[in-house]
Interface confidence: medium
C-alpha cells in the first residue's frame, strides 16, 4: 500500500502526501486515496480540474467522482506504460460538459464506465470508439452508465441530445460487446431507431425516467440476450403489436413498465390481451390507465374489450368548440 504521512498503515485507503519529486510508478497522486491490495484509487470530492497524471499502474478501480473536470480531452487516461489494469472508471458528478473523441483510448481493460450526473453539452461521436473509422477496434466496455447526462436547455447544442448520444453509441460498431447500458433520466423523447441494432450483446437496458412517448420505431428484435428492459416513468401511451411481438420473442427478457400514462382506449386492446397472457412484464398487475378521465386508475389487467372504446371522430361540420 502506498505510503502516506497522515494515515496509519492499517487503513484500507491511504491518502497521498504531495511530493515535488517525480512520481514513482505506484505512488498515490496528491488528493487521492490508494489501496494497492484493493487495486483502487479514490480521488473523490476534491475539486480536481484534470485527471491526475501519476496514477499507479496497479489501479483497477478508479473513482474520480465529485470533481470539476469540465473537459475530458483525447487520451485523458493515456499513460506510458498504459494503465493496463484499469477496469472500472467512475467519473460521475464531476461537472463534465465535454467528452472528446478518444478520451478513453489506451485503456485496454476498461469494462465499466460511469459518466452519470455530468451535464454533457458535447459528447463526441468517437468518445467510446476512439476513431472515426466506419468499423473501429472493439471497445472492451461491458457496462456503460450514462444516467442524467442531459445538459440544461441553455447549454444544449443545436442537434438533438438523443442524436448526439446515439452517434457515440453506434460509432464504428465499437460497442458490440456492451452488456449493460443505463440511459435513465435524460429527457429522451425518442430512441433513435438504429441504436439497438448496433448493441446486440445487451443484457440490461435502462431507459427509465425519460419522456419516451412511443416505441413504434424501435426494434428489439436482435437483442436476443436481453434480460432486463427498464421503461418505467416514461410517457408511453400504448405498446403496439409489433413491439409486443418482439418483446415476447426475446427468450430471457423482463420488462418494467410502471408509471407510464397508459391511454385506455380502443388502441389498447391488443396490449391488454398480451398483458394477460405474457410472463415478460414484471409487476404487470400494477399498471393502470391514466387516460381518458373515465378510465383513470383502472387496472389494465382487469379491462376487457368492452371497456376499451374510442370516441367516434365527428366530421368537421358537426364538431363544436
Amino acid at each position: 500500500t502506498s505510503s502516506a504521512s497522515s494515515s496509519s498503515s492499517s487503513a484500507p485507503f491511504l491518502a497521498s502526501a504531495a511530493s515535488a519529486q517525480p512520481p514513482l510508478p505506484d505512488q498515490c497522486p496528491a488528493l487521492c486515496e490508494c489501496s494497492e491490495a484493493a487495486r483502487t484509487v479514490k480521488c473523490v470530492n476534491r475539486n480536481l480540474t484534470e485527471v491526475p497524471t501519476d496514477l499507479p499502474l496497479y489501479v483497477r478501480n478508479l473513482f474520480l467522482t465529485g470533481n470539476q473536470l469540465a473537459v475530458l480531452p483525447a487520451g485523458a487516461f493515456a499513460r506510458r506504460p498504459p494503465l493496463a489494469e484499469l477496469a472500472a472508471l467512475n467519473l460521475s458528478g464531476s461537472r463534465l460538459d465535454e467528452v472528446r473523441g478518444g478520451a478513453f483510448e489506451h485503456l485496454p481493460s476498461l469494462r465499466q464506465l460511469d459518466l452519470s450526473h455530468n451535464p454533457l453539452a458535447y459528447l463526441s461521436p468517437f468518445a467510446f470508439s476512439g476513431s472515426n473509422a466506419s468499423i473501429s477496434a472493439p471497445s472492451p466496455l461491458v457496462e456503460l452508465i450514462l444516467n442524467h447526462i442531459v445538459p440544461p436547455d441553455d447549454k444544449r447544442q443545436n442537434r438533438s441530445f438523443e442524436g448526439m448520444v446515439a452517434a457515440a453509441l453506434v460509432a464504428g460498431r465499437a460497442l458490440q460487446g456492451l452488456h449493460l447500458l443505463e440511459l435513465a433520466s435524460n429527457h429522451f423523447l425518442y430512441l433513435p431507431r438504429d441504436v439497438l441494432a448496433q448493441l446486440p450483446s445487451l443484457r440490461y437496458l435502462d431507459l427509465s425516467n425519460n419522456s419516451l412517448v412511443s416505441l413504434t420505431y424501435v426494434s428489439f428484435r436482435n437483442l436476443t440476450h436481453l434480460e432486463s428492459l427498464h421503461l418505467e416513468d416514461n410517457a408511453l401511451k400504448v405498446l403496439h403489436n409489433g413491439t409486443l411481438a418482439e418483446l415476447q420473442g426475446l427468450p430471457h427478457v423482463r420488462v418494467f413498465l410502471d408509471n407510464n400514462p397508459w391511454v385506455c382506449d380502443c388502441h389498447m386492446a391488443d396490449m391488454v390481451t398480451w398483458l394477460k397472457q405474457t410472463g415478460v412484464v414484471q409487476g404487470k398487475d400494477r399498471l393502470t390507465c391514466a387516460f381518458p378521465e373515465k378510465m383513470r386508475n383502472r387496472v389494465l389487467l382487469e379491462l376487457n374489450s368492452a371497456d376499451l372504446d374510442c370516441d367516434p371522430i365527428l366530421p368537421p361540420s358537426l364538431q363544436t368548440s
Partner: antibody, heavy 122, light 110 residues
Framework: EVQLEESGGGLVKPGGSLRLSCAAS????????VGWVRQAPGKGLEWVSI???????YYANWAKGRFTISRDNSKNTLYLQMNSLRAEDTAVYYC????????????????WGRGTLVTVSS | DIQMTQSPSTLSASVGDRVTITCQAS??????LAWYQQKPGKAPKLLIY???TLESGVPSRFSGSGSGTEFTLTISSLQPDDFATYYC????????????FGQGTKVEIK
C-alpha cells in the same frame, strides 16, 4: 490487509436453517459484486449466488427459493440464508469477491475467504 | 443453461512437462472465462481471466487461450508447486445456470 472471513457454519439437521456471514476487512464490500461458492467434500466447486452493487441478485437454479443472499453495507458483511437444508448441501461455503466493481455484470473472483463448513445430518 | 465441461478429469505429469487442460462451454461465452488453481484445504486462486489475461502475481508459465466454446489452460513447464486441481469458470451469464464452474482437472505426479 484485504480479506474475507466466513462464519456461521456448523451442524444442522435436514430441513433446518442456517445463516452464513462473510465479513470484509480492508475493502468496502458495497462497491463490489460478491457471492458464494461451495464445495462438497471431495467434489468440485459449485457456484451458489451473487449480489451486485446495485442489489441485483442471481442464484443457481437449484438454490432458488431455498437460499437468499443479502448484504449489510453498514457492517461491511455479506450473508447467505439457507433454508430447508438437505444432506447434499453439506459443503465448505466460500465467500468470494468479484475482481472489480460493477453494478450489474463482471464474471470472475479474485479474492476468496477460507470457507466455513456446513454439515447437514440427522 | 450453459454447462462447462473440462477434460481430462485427471492428468498425470512430471516436473518440466508441458500440460494442457481444456474447457468446453455448451454455448458461446465469448472470452468470458476464468481459470483457478486449488490446493487441498485451501480456497481457489484466480490464475487467468477473460480467457487469456494473466492475473497479477501469477507466474508466466501459465497461459490461457480460446474464445467462443473452446478454451485451453497451458502450463509451459510444470513446477512442483503446480500439482493441484484446476477449474474453469464462465463469467458470461449468471442467469438460469446450475453451475458456473467446470468439474475440475486434477494434475497429479506421474
Amino acid at each position: 490487509e484485504v480479506q474475507l472471513e466466513e462464519s456461521g457454519g456448523g451442524l444442522v439437521k435436514p430441513g433446518g436453517s442456517l445463516r452464513l456471514s462473510c465479513a470484509a476487512s480492508g475493502i468496502d464490500l458495497s462497491h463490489y459484486v460478491v457471492g458464494w461458492v461451495r464445495q462438497a467434500p471431495g467434489k468440485g466447486l459449485e457456484w451458489v449466488s451473487i449480489i451486485y452493487g446495485s442489489g441485483r441478485t442471481y442464484y443457481a437454479n437449484w438454490a432458488k427459493g431455498r437460499f437468499t443472499i443479502s448484504r449489510d453495507n453498514s457492517k461491511n458483511t455479506l450473508y447467505l440464508q439457507m433454508n430447508s437444508l438437505r444432506a447434499e448441501d453439506t459443503a465448505v461455503y466460500y465467500c468470494a469477491r468479484d475482481a472489480s466493481v460493477s453494478v450489474y455484470y463482471w464474471g470472475y473472483f479474485d479474492l476468496w475467504g477460507r470457507g466455513t463448513l456446513v454439515t447437514v445430518s440427522s | 443453461d450453459i454447462q462447462m465441461t473440462q477434460s481430462p478429469s485427471t492428468l498425470s505429469a512430471s516436473v518440466g512437462d508441458r500440460v494442457t487442460i481444456t474447457c468446453q462451454a455448451s454455448q458461446s461465452i465469448g472470452s468470458e472465462l476464468a481459470w483457478y488453481q486449488q490446493k487441498p484445504g485451501k480456497a481457489p486462486k484466480l490464475l487467468i481471466y477473460r480467457a487469456s489475461t494473466l492475473e497479477s502475481g501469477v507466474p508466466s508459465r501459465f497461459s490461457g487461450s480460446g474464445s467462443g466454446t473452446e478454451f485451453t489452460l497451458t502450463i509451459s513447464s510444470l513446477q512442483p508447486d503446480d500439482f493441484a486441481t484446476y477449474y474453469c469458470q464462465q463469467g458470461y451469464t449468471y442467469s438460469e445456470i446450475d453451475n458456473a464452474f467446470g468439474q475440475g482437472t486434477k494434475v497429479e505426479i506421474k
